[in-house]
Each structure stands twice: as C-alpha cells, then as structure tokens.
C-alpha cells in the first residue's frame, strides 16, 4: 500500500489482509459516496482470517494469521491504524493466537471471541482496554467456536455459528457483560460457518458462510424481540469466509471464498427493499478480510 | 462407496512438470479437506499439501511450497496436485485422502497412490 | 517443525501377543495425534485419532492413549491381518509430521 498523505477523513469502509494463494497485508478503503478505493499503509505482516474493528475513530486489526510460502503462524496481534496517519502501531497481544476469530466493540472495550491456534479450538474470550492496553480474560463461550460471526446488539455480545473442530454449527450464544455469562439463544435455520453477522435496525445478520457441504448465499435475521430467525433476500453470490459492515443503514459484504473463486464481489444489502446489489469489486479476489467502518 | 482414485503419476526428467487428479466418488469433496501425502520408495510418510473447503485456503510442506499447487474442482468432484520444477527427492507415491479438517487426521479413504518418478 | 520420535522401528511378535508402540513428540501436541496401519503396496489406514478415539469400523484391539509428550498405540492380541507397518502422525501445528514408521513382522 502506500504512504504517501493520509485520506481524508470520512465514513469509508476499510478491509484489511484476506488470502490469495497466501494471506495478504493490504488496507484498502471504500467511499460509498463516490464508489472509489484507497490503497492505504499495509499491514505489518499479511493476515488472513483476522478481524477488523473500529474504537475512537481508530481501526484495530485482531488475530489471523499468516499463511505464506515460509509457512504458517497463528496471531495473537493487536495492531491499531490511524486513519489522520496512515499509519500502523502494534497493541498488547491478546494470550492465545486466535485464527479465523470474531470480534465485537462493547463501550469501546474490544471483545476477542474463539478462533484457533493450530487444531485448538478455542471457546475462550478476551476484552481489550485501548486506554490500558491490556487484556482480560472473561467467561469463556459454551461453545467452541472459529469461524465464528459476532456482532453487538444492545450491549449484548452475540457469537453466531463457526466451527468446533467436528460440526459446523448453527447454535448462537449471547454475552451479558454486567453478569459475566453466555447464554445460549435461538439456533439459526441453518449450519453456518464462515459468515458475514452485523446488526442491523435491532436485529443480527448472517450472511453465507458454509454448512459443511457448500457455501451458501442465503441470509437470515434474529430479531431479539420475538427470539426467531427469519430469512431475507439471498445474495447474489455464494460467499464463505466473506467480509461484512453496515454503512448509513445498509448491509456490504466483501469477498470470501465460493467454493471455486475467491471473489473479488462487494454486494449490498437494502433492508427497505430487500435485494442485494453489486455495488463495486475489490482491487483483486480473497478471503478472510478484516473489515470495519470509520466513525464519522 | 467412498473412494479416491489417484492418476497422474508416471516419469518425468528433473525441471519438468506433472499435474496429479484425484477422483473421489461417494462423497463431495466440497464437504471435505483434502490432503496429499507421499512415500518415498522404502521410506515413510510424508504430508505435502491441504486445501480447505470453507476458505480456500492451502497449506504446504516447505520443501513444496511455491512448487506445487493444490487445487479442487467441486463440479468434477475432482482435486488436484500441480508439480512444477520436479527434483529427483519428489520421487515417491503420492497419495491422496480426505480429512475431517484442515489440519485433522486423515481418514482412510486413501487411494491406492500414484507413483510419480522423477530421473534423467 | 515438531518432531515425531517412534518406537522401535522394527519388532517381532506372534499371534496373540500384545504389542505396544510408541511416538515421542518433541514439543507439547496436546491429544492431536492419529495412528496408521499401512500394508505394503498399499495406502495408509487411519487407525486412532486424537490420540485415544478408535476410528469406526477399527476392530477394538487398537487403543490408543497419551501421557504427557508420549503417545502409545497397544494391540490387545496380535491377529494375523495385523503384521504391517505402523505410523504416527501429529495435527497440532503446522507442518503435520508423522514418525519414522514400526514395522511389525511375525516371529
């Protein structure tokens, strides 16, 4: 990527790393508004299956791992971009590599959901403090999970789906910060590994994702009032391993892995309507990005 | 019947190339990881080469990487293992099985191998 | 890369003995670690995965179990189908290595 002067400031989606024959160390950014890509600062070392997220106008790159031709390590990374920079600084590592993780921002405390480190499973969760730089344990899931989409939803810290070594599962759990426990929610009407989950307008998506035998397309919603999940429009590409954010009130999903292609496709979701629509491609195919949206 | 059925193999001089097919029946190899493994003539076992069907991602034994390729076609239920710049110690049977994961064990439905020789 | 130390490399043994073989791991590996039986000419069979759980249709004279970085498969009663070659193989992290072999031919 380059260094030359930092963007402008504004509400841009950013995707970090993702896999293409090997993990990748790219930052690129998103401007809905005029349909153009930055090439930003890369990463300091390429990291696929990491997660993207944003605290104080800050974005935070957790976990991954780099999977290249000299080999392959798990990360326990934190690495924090600021965007009045373009530039990367390294954060306290969390206490486990954590690969194909999720992650999720609850009163700008950074929460570090599952993953894997080599074949271990991982249903434990850390919480980041940026302001202490530090890291600390909290209850674990009743789940292992990598693979594992998470999102936040009225204070509350939602695990979707994944992976637990032997199944892929269509279970959800749901984190109560005030009391330190996971309780298990309402299971998804499908096995989903892989998936893109955010929240829109008081419910939690997941998009795609893999059930064990294909990639899907199919989306389905949970709406915390009634404690049902309902399927929407499908999208237009099969995606597992796929980015996801919510941008001034609609859904994008970036990349992911089809089964045959590693796409390259950015579709976008409008609730009020119900389609998906190709909205714009990334520079290049991949997996496995990190993914998160500015604060204006 | 779950089966893999290897093909490919055969001589080749070093420098060359040679693409090795894996044919599997009773199962979608989209449901699987799949994996090659090799045995040098009287030696032992040796993992080359993964792919895994949720990300697409590969992994690959050191002494193959940026050689080899492994490759699925889902529509011909059919994997694949690219060689490329053939040395004389890739001289073996390349085996290849279906895994529950990634980096899991491999389950027995191995093929009965390809010998693939690599000689001037 | 970790490394994966059987033992013996070779034994004899009759029908109806128990034979135990074992595999050192050099680095911990937690229980990620299957055993195979290979024939000559043919491919590797999945005996034992995660170090203890017998894989299905594996008669129940295999059993496998872990102590630490030691890894042990026991036949109960050597059964004639069973003279072959025997491997571990660790999955904890990459690469996967597998031991050097023990081959198990009859007295």
């Known amino acids: 990527g380059s260094m030359g002067h930092a963007p402008k400031v504004g509400r841009l989606i950013y995707t970090a790393g993702g896999y293409f024959r090997q993990s990748l160390s790219y930052l690129e950014a998103y401007n809905p508004s005029d349909g153009t890509w930055l090439d930003l600062a890369d990463l300091q070392v390429p990291r696929s299956g990491l997660a993207g997220c944003v605290v104080g106008g800050l974005l935070y790159a957790v976990g991954g791992r780099n999977n290249s031709p000299d080999g392959n390590t798990d990360s326990s990374a934190l690495d924090c971009y600021n965007p009045m920079t373009n530039q990367w600084s390294p954060c306290a590592p969390m206490s486990v590599p954590r690969n194909r993780i999720g992650v999720g921002v609850i009163d700008g405390h950074i929460y570090a959901v599952g993953g894997s480190h080599g074949c271990i499973h991982h249903n434990s969760v850390e919480r980041y403090e940026p302001e202490r730089d530090e890291w600390h344990l909290v209850a674990p899931m009743l789940t292992r999970r990598i693979g594992v989409g998470v999102a936040v939803l009225n204070r509350l810290l939602y695990a979707v789906g994944g992976f637990d070594g032997t199944n892929r599962l269509n279970s959800a759990e749901c984190y109560y910060p005030e009391r330190n426990e996971w309780r298990m929610i309402t299971a998804m009407n499908t096995i989903r590994s892989g998936a893109g989950v955010c929240v829109l307008h008081n419910c939690i998506y997941a998009a795609g994702g893999y059930d064990g035998q294909d990639q899907l397309n199919s989306v389905e919603r949970y709406d915390v009032e009634t404690e049902t999940w309902t399927f929407v429009a499908p999208m237009k590409h099969r995606r597992s391993a796929l980015g996801i954010t919510v941008h001034q009130g609609r859904i994008y999903v970036l990349g992911g892995y089809d089964g045959h292609t590693f796409l390259d496709s950015v579709e976008c979701y409008d609730p009020d309507t119900d389609t998906w629509s190709e909205v714009t491609r990334m520079t290049s195919g991949r997996s496995g990005v990190g993914v998160a949206v500015t604060m204006e | 019947e779950v089966q893999l059925v290897e093909s490919g193999g055969g001589l080749v001089q070093p420098g060359g190339s040679l693409r090795l097919s894996c044919a599997a029946s009773g199962f979608a190899i989209s449901a699987s990881s799949i994996h090659w493994v090799r045995q040098a003539p009287g030696k032992g076992l040796e993992w080359v080469a993964s792919?895994?069907?949720?990300?697409?991602?590969?992994l690959y034994a050191k002494s193959v990487a940026g050689r080899f390729t492994i490759s699925a076609d889902t529509s011909k239920n059919t994997a694949y293992l690219q060689m490329n710049s053939l040395r004389a110690e890739d001289t073996a049977v390349y085996y290849c099985?279906?895994?529950?994961?990634?980096?899991?064990?491999?389950?027995?439905?191995a093929g009965q191998g390809t010998l693939v020789t690599v000689s001037s | 890369d970790i490394q994966m130390t059987q033992s013996p490399s070779s034994l004899s043994a009759s029908v109806g003995d128990r034979v135990t073989i074992t595999c050192r791991a050099s680095?911990?590996?937690?229980?990620?670690v299957a055993w195979y039986q290979q024939k000559p000419g043919k491919a590797p069979k999945l005996l034992i995965y995660s170090a203890s759980s017998l894989y299905s249709g594996v008669p129940s004279r295999f059993s496998g179990s872990r102590s630490g970085t030691d890894f042990t498969l026991t036949i109960s009663s050597l059964q004639p189908e069973d003279f072959a070659t025997y491997y571990c193989?660790?999955?904890?992290?990459?690469?996967?290595?597998f031991g050097q072999g023990t081959k198990v031919e009859i007295k």
């Open positions: 792919i895994d069907p949720e990300t697409g991602e590969t």
């Open positions: 680095q911990s590996v937690s229980s990620a």
């Open positions: 193989q660790q999955s904890y992290s990459f690469p996967s290595t």
């Open positions: 099985a279906r895994g529950e994961w990634f980096y899991g064990a491999l389950s027995d439905y």
